[in-house]
């Protein structure tokens, strides 16, 4: 693989455009944050492949690692993955954003870790601090990765100065998960509450008689202490519980609540954390998308599913053509809304042995006192195609006609075919397709009608045969998205005194 320019580190101007190329003997691809950004493929006469990454209107957020790999990387040799690091110094971007999981660093042993606070400019001086302290910690910094070292279980922030303003990173929480004889569990009555509602958390320790609980929570950091209550669960020996209760929650109470438990005899400790979100008001949000047109097959069962998030628990109603639906006593419709997690719901409408009359406009509405959401779609009932009639007649004009009539939903296509050699066809000889060809032998006339009440299409097709000089097997095939049906008739010449 050859990367141009080779790097391994580039510093680019904000708002400019920059072009990178990567070439190799097989198709190559650029990757950024485990995804493939828009790029363009080109090829040389000697068979070399290249991928061109055009970075336009660069911002600090384009800072980071870029990799070029073979499109079908099978081996893991070093030459099969080239790394390039790009800086775009941008005074409007302080620290590069982190995913939530990067802010929590968990350890099971004493080992070197990296606090991944990164800036857009390699010239900036970056320092590391404990969240509550001003003293810079003596830890080496790599502008491409962050601070690497051995850290205690604390909260850390990075600081830098851009121009004349000091910028702080998000807080990074280092947790050393020690294998310990103390086993702590933390749970909340609710992890999402509205402002004004109560937050109640419980921290339970099993198997110890004397322990010390210490809670850390957002209010504590602003000096507003809450006194926890400790009790013993009498029906369970050595189960000790600490309850942290915050009445009338405020938005600032959102954050991480940590229960740290220590026992002094063996100097064991353990801690667990839980995130609490305080929202201004309740919400209902759809997750994923449901197409505006849904299909069901006649006489089959069909479940239509809507996934959404809500707090507080909502009321869910389903409507068909603006009329409220309920579970039918005949078992034709089943409605269910399941709570799959604290704030996530799945609502399902099941139509059992679908009937044509169940086509129509469906709406699901989820609501509570603070918010509502609704989702609508059209349900089309697909009916497998069937040939209802295939008949042959001899009008006075001398020609012979074959009429084929059938129905289905969606609209069926009609295919006419014929076989002249009755002994060998269709096993040995494929049938010949018939239609409005340039030949005078056959002519086709097809009419389509939509039957509103039955909600299906009817196709009537008439095939006119000019000269039938020997018995002819004529086949009418109707086909649609959910099936096909065929009927066959044998057409004999006028002159023959019998029909098979």
């Amino acid at each position: 693989l050859v990367v141009t320019p080779p790097g391994p580190e580039l510093v680019l101007n904000v708002s400019s455009t920059f072009v990178l190329t990567c070439s190799g003997s097989a198709p190559v691809v650029w990757e950024r944050m485990s995804q493939e950004p828009p790029q363009e493929m080109a090829k040389a006469q000697d068979g070399t492949f290249s991928s061109v990454l055009t970075l336009t209107n660069l911002t600090g957020l384009d800072t980071g690692e870029y990799f070029c790999t073979h499109n079908d990387s099978r081996g893991l040799e070093t030459d099969e993955r080239k790394r390039l690091y790009i800086f775009v110094p941008d005074p409007t971007v302080g620290f590069l954003p982190n995913d939530a999981e990067e802010l929590f660093i968990f350890l099971t042993e004493i080992t070197e870790i990296t606090i991944p606070c990164r800036v857009t400019d390699p010239q900036l001086v970056v320092t590391l601090h404990e969240k509550k302290g001003d003293v810079a910690l003596p830890v080496p910094y790599d502008h491409q990765r962050g601070f690497s070292g051995i850290f205690e279980d604390r909260s850390y922030i990075c600081k830098t100065t851009i121009g004349d303003r000091e910028v702080d990173s998000d807080a990074y929480y280092v947790y050393r998960l020690q294998v310990s004889s103390i086993n702590v569990s933390v749970n909340a009555v609710q992890t999402v509450v509205r402002q004004g509602e109560n937050i109640t958390l419980m921290c339970i320790v099993i198997g110890n008689e004397v322990v010390n609980f210490e809670w850390t929570y957002p209010r504590k950091e602003s000096g507003r202490l809450v006194e926890p209550v400790t009790d013993f669960l009498l029906d369970m020996p050595y189960h000790i519980r600490s309850i942290l209760h915050i009445p009338s929650a405020e938005l600032e109470d959102s954050g991480t609540y940590t229960c740290n438990v220590t026992e002094s005899v063996n100097d064991h400790q353990d801690e667990k954390a839980i995130n609490i979100t305080v929202v201004e008001s309740g919400y209902v949000r759809l997750l994923g998308e449901v197409g505006t047109l849904q299909f069901a097959e006649l006489h089959r069962s069909r479940t239509l599913q809507v996934v959404f998030e809500a707090y507080p628990p909502p009321t869910v109603l389903w409507f068909k053509d603006n009329r409220t639906l309920g579970d039918s006593s005949a078992g034709e419709i089943a409605l269910s809304t399941r709570n799959v997690s604290e704030t996530r719901y799945v609502s399902e409408l099941t139509l059992v042995r679908v009937k044509v009359a169940e086509a129509g406009h469906y709406t699901m509405r989820a609501f509570h006192e603070d918010a509502e959401v609704q989702l609508s779609f059209q349900l089309q009932i697909n009916v497998p195609v069937r040939v209802l009639e295939l008949s042959e007649s001899h009008p006075d004009s001398g020609e012979q006609t074959v009429r084929c009539r059938g129905r289905g939903m969606p609209q069926p296509n009609i295919i006419w075919s014929a076989c002249r050699d009755l002994k060998r066809c269709p096993r040995e000889l494929p049938p010949t397709l018939l239609g409005n060809s340039s030949e005078e032998e056959s002519q086709l006339e097809t009419n389509v009608t939509y039957w509103e009440e039955e909600q299906e299409f009817e196709v009537v097709s008439t095939l006119r045969l000019q000269h039938v000089d020997r018995p002819l097997s004529v086949r009418c095939t109707l086909r649609n998205a959910v099936g096909q049906d065929t009927q066959e008739v044998i057409v004999v010449p006028h002159s023959l005194p019998f029909k098979v």
Epitope: V2, T4, P5, L12, N13, S16, T17, F18, V19, L20, T21, S23, A44, Q45, D46, T48, S50, T54, L58
Partner: nanobody, 113 residues
Framework: EVQLVESGGGLAQAGGSLRLSCVAS????????MAWYRQAPGKQRELVAH??????YYVASVEGRFTISRANAKDTWYLQMNSLKPEDTGVYYC????????WSQGTQVTVSS
């Protein structure tokens, strides 16, 4: 700061030819090659060809019809376009590989059928 000036565009018949030139000034010696792009009306700018380390690369739609080259003067690049098609119509831009720069005005190519 790199300055780019494209020329040679114009009106051509389908099947005809045009040769586009790109004259670059500034610290162009630092570039690792040159790319040609085009932008058809109402569409996104797209790569046409590029030359890197002396090797020329072409996108599938122009392969065998277009040729990218560099003049002996070192600061000039060409795009020879043969067997032109109406879908080759657009504004053509050159852009250096491996240099922070800004797009220039480009040169308009119109191919009539």
């Amino acid at each position: 700061e790199v300055q780019l000036v494209e020329s040679g565009g114009g009106l051509a018949q389908a099947g005809g030819s045009l040769r586009l030139s790109c004259v670059a000034s500034g610290n162009i010696d630092s570039a690792n090659g040159m790319a040609w792009y085009r932008q058809a009306p109402g569409k996104q700018r797209e790569l046409v060809a590029h030359i890197t380390s002396g090797t020329s690369y072409y996108v599938a739609s122009v392969e065998g019809r277009f040729t990218i080259s560099r003049a002996n003067a070192k600061d000039t690049w060409y795009l020879q376009m043969n067997s032109l098609k109406p879908e080759d119509t657009g504004v053509y831009y050159c852009f250096p590989i491996g240099l922070s720069a800004h797009w220039s005005q480009g040169t308009q190519v119109t191919v009539s059928s």
